[in-house]
């Protein structure tokens, strides 16, 4: 069975820069990847960046950066120009489409002890969505 | 149109460092990693590592740790990957290649000729 | 690191002909594999993604497939301009590493 996982981390130099890495783990072809903050994509959650394999990649604030980082996980920066933070609270969420498989996402956030630099283990987390 | 440009051939002593340049033209090293990659005569691919030109950030082949050293100046557009401690094992075509608006090397450099010998 | 084991070394065949390639990796990639092509004298090209995507403006003569550690790479029907050594990489997890390489040459 196909599986996402997500792993957010707060850059240890800069305080109020973030980083969400997702990956998927199965046999398809990755056709798109969606992140959104503040629940699922099309369930409440807002989009912060698409990339698509072939047309490349798109992001919007406060995404700064969304890049592949192999074919199978991807990683998004993330700056926060307000004084307080609010990602530290955010639910980050990850969906693949995947051909044959279909789509899968997972969501993670910030762990609450995280120390700048650290990073939630990169294990699979449950998959809540798979269309 | 994309392109990678290369700094051209090295001749240099055993011991010595070299930097090599890659200097990125149609699209914005900080949109990418770019990474490095090594090849000797009749001999496969071997990768170097790669740096996030964004904040400097470097990964390396375990093999290639303290041998190499990559860095990026995004007001240029430029990567760099500085050898040191040249041995004539050093000697072989090394090419930059981006990686990260698609999940593949989609543009190489032409490659740099590094020759080490007394 | 994955090792990545590419067989055969040489190829020599005649225009027309099939030729297969494959790459064994040491362990599981799932499809995290890509061919390349390269031509004496110039930087490698890619051929195929995922294992089986075929890139923009590449022949159909060039096909891969494969998942888990066993993929293979075939040229349906061998071209005069074919002639260059192909590689297979994966970049599943890091460091990126490539088979050794097949050099084909034409009869």
């Known amino acids: 069975t196909p599986e996402v996982w997500v792993q957010v981390q707060m850059e240890a130099t800069e305080l109020s820069s973030f980083t969400v890495h997702c990956g998927f783990l199965g046999p398809g072809s990755i056709s798109l990847v969606t992140v959104s903050w503040g629940g699922p994509d099309g369930a409440g959650g807002t989009k912060l960046a698409v990339l698509h394999p072939e047309l490349g990649t798109r992001q919007w604030a406060p995404a700064r950066q969304a890049r592949w980082e192999t074919q199978s996980s991807i990683s998004l920066a993330l700056e926060d120009s307000g004084a307080s933070s609010p990602f530290a609270n955010t639910t980050f969420c990850c969906k693949f489409a995947s051909f044959p498989e279909g789509s899968w996402e997972s969501c993670g956030s910030l762990p609450p002890s995280s120390d700048p630099g650290l990073s939630a283990p990169p294990t699979p987390v449950p998959i809540l969505r798979a269309d | 149109e994309v392109q990678l440009q290369q700094s051209g051939a090295e001749l240099v002593k055993p011991g010595a460092s070299v930097k090599l340049s890659c200097t990125a033209s149609?699209?914005?090293?900080?949109?990418?990693?770019m990474h490095w990659l090594k090849q000797r005569p009749e001999q496969g691919l071997e990768w170097i590592g790669r740096?996030?030109?964004?904040?400097?950030?470097?990964e390396y082949d375990p093999r290639f740790q303290g041998k190499a050293t990559l860095t990026a100046d995004t007001s240029s557009n430029i990567a760099y990957l500085q050898l040191s401690s040249l041995t004539s094992e050093d000697t072989a075509v090394y090419y930059c290649a981006r990686f990260g608006i698609y999940p593949y090397f989609d543009y190489w450099g032409q490659g740099t000729t590094l020759t080490v010998s007394s | 690191s994955i090792v990545m084991t590419q067989t055969p070394k040489f190829l020599l065949v005649s225009a027309g002909d099939r030729v297969t390639i494959t790459c064994k990796a040491s362990?599981?990639?799932?499809?995290?594999v890509v061919w390349y092509q390269q031509k004496p004298g110039q930087s490698p090209k890619l051929l195929i993604n995922y294992a089986s995507n075929r890139y923009t403006g590449v022949p159909d003569r060039f096909t891969g497939s494969g998942y888990g550690t066993d993929f293979t790479f075939s040229i349906s029907t061998v071209q005069a301009e074919d002639l260059a050594v192909y590689f297979c990489q994966q970049d599943y997890s890091s460091p990126w590493t490539f088979g050794g390489g097949t050099k084909l040459e034409i009869k």
């Open positions: 362990q599981s990639v799932n499809k995290a």
């Open positions: 149609g699209f914005n090293i900080k949109d990418i990693y």
């Open positions: 740096v996030d030109p964004t904040n400097g950030n470097s």
